[in-house]
């Protein structure tokens, strides 16, 4: 079969790292500088991917693998291999159009990327704030005031996977 | 111009060892690649193994783990050790230099004139 297949078409012994040269009467040749081919019975190498400005080399290109990038201190990844690099702000922060803001009043952001968002209403659960929320850090919940009887004292912060605003299913 | 000089080929028995010389002289400062191909009769060239000037590794998945390709730069000499060698190795092996890329195809592509190795019983 292999003997069949390799007769039918010359390219399809030639490894990663290759391509099959028209100019060479369709020979393997290894790949030229700069690009690669991750699979083997190539015609040409893919150009490698160059990473320049904001972005930094984080695997160098080879001859069967592309390079890799991601983003310069003061950035974070954004897309499918780190196609876009997007400013950091200061928790307490996101990135609009403007730059960097401050979360308004009754939101907050513990990272350095993403959105403000809002506080967790204790009340929908049925229980009090126990510390108040900052553009920083979220509310905590406490027990609502039924649970207070004497030795009942549990602490519940916000789960982060429910959304704001939301009551149990 | 390159000239490529192949030597170290012969007959050997199966499971044994050979290794493969080319000697490259003439304009060898703009060589990208050096390369080993084989040939056997009435069979197309196929790639074996090849090898660029920042030392890059290329092997042919038929040779992978027997074949190892390296050179010396102060002899300007490429080599080919072909370990644990099997009746279908028998071919004509070819060296070849490259040239520079020139964005289309590489900018020349010289072949030394070939040294036979026979795995045989």
């Known amino acids: 079969f292999e003997r069949t297949r390799s007769l039918q078409d010359p390219c399809s012994n030639c490894p990663a790292g290759t391509f099959c040269d028209n100019n060479r009467n369709q020979i393997c040749s290894p790949c030229p500088p700069n690009s690669f081919s991750s699979a083997g019975g190539q015609r040409t190498c893919d150009i490698c991917r160059q990473c320049k400005g904001v972005f930094r080399t984080r695997k160098e290109c080879s001859s069967t693998s592309n390079a890799e990038c991601d983003c310069t201190p003061g950035f974070h990844c954004l897309g499918a291999g780190c196609s876009m690099c997007e400013q950091d702000c200061k928790q307490g922060q996101e990135l609009t159009k403007k730059g960097c803001k401050d979360c308004c009043f009754g939101t907050f952001n513990d990272q350095k990327r993403g959105i403000c968002r809002p506080w967790t209403n204790c009340s929908l659960d049925g229980k009090s704030v126990l510390v108040n929320g900052t553009k920083e850090r979220d509310v905590v919940c406490g027990p609502s005031p039924a649970d207070l009887s004497p030795g009942a004292s549990s602490v519940t912060p916000p789960a982060p996977a429910r959304e704001p605003g939301h009551s149990p299913q | 111009a390159v000239q490529l000089v192949e030597s170290g080929g012969g007959l050997v028995q199966p499971g044994g060892s050979l290794r493969l010389s080319c000697a490259a002289s003439g304009s060898i400062f703009s060589i990208y690649a050096m390369a080993w191909y084989r040939q056997a009769p009435g069979k197309q060239r196929d790639f074996v193994a090849s090898?660029?000037?920042?030392?890059?590794?290329i092997y042919a998945d038929s040779v992978k783990g027997r074949f190892t390709i390296s050179r010396d730069n102060a002899k300007n000499t490429t080599y080919l050790q072909m370990n644990s060698l099997k009746p279908e190795d028998t071919a004509v092996y070819y060296c070849?230099?490259?040239?520079?890329?020139?964005?289309?195809?590489?900018?020349?592509?010289?072949w030394g004139q070939g040294t036979q190795v026979t795995v045989s019983s």
């Open positions: 090898i660029t000037s920042g030392g890059s590794t």
């Open positions: 070849n230099s490259l040239g520079s890329w020139d964005g289309e195809r590489y900018e020349y592509d010289y």
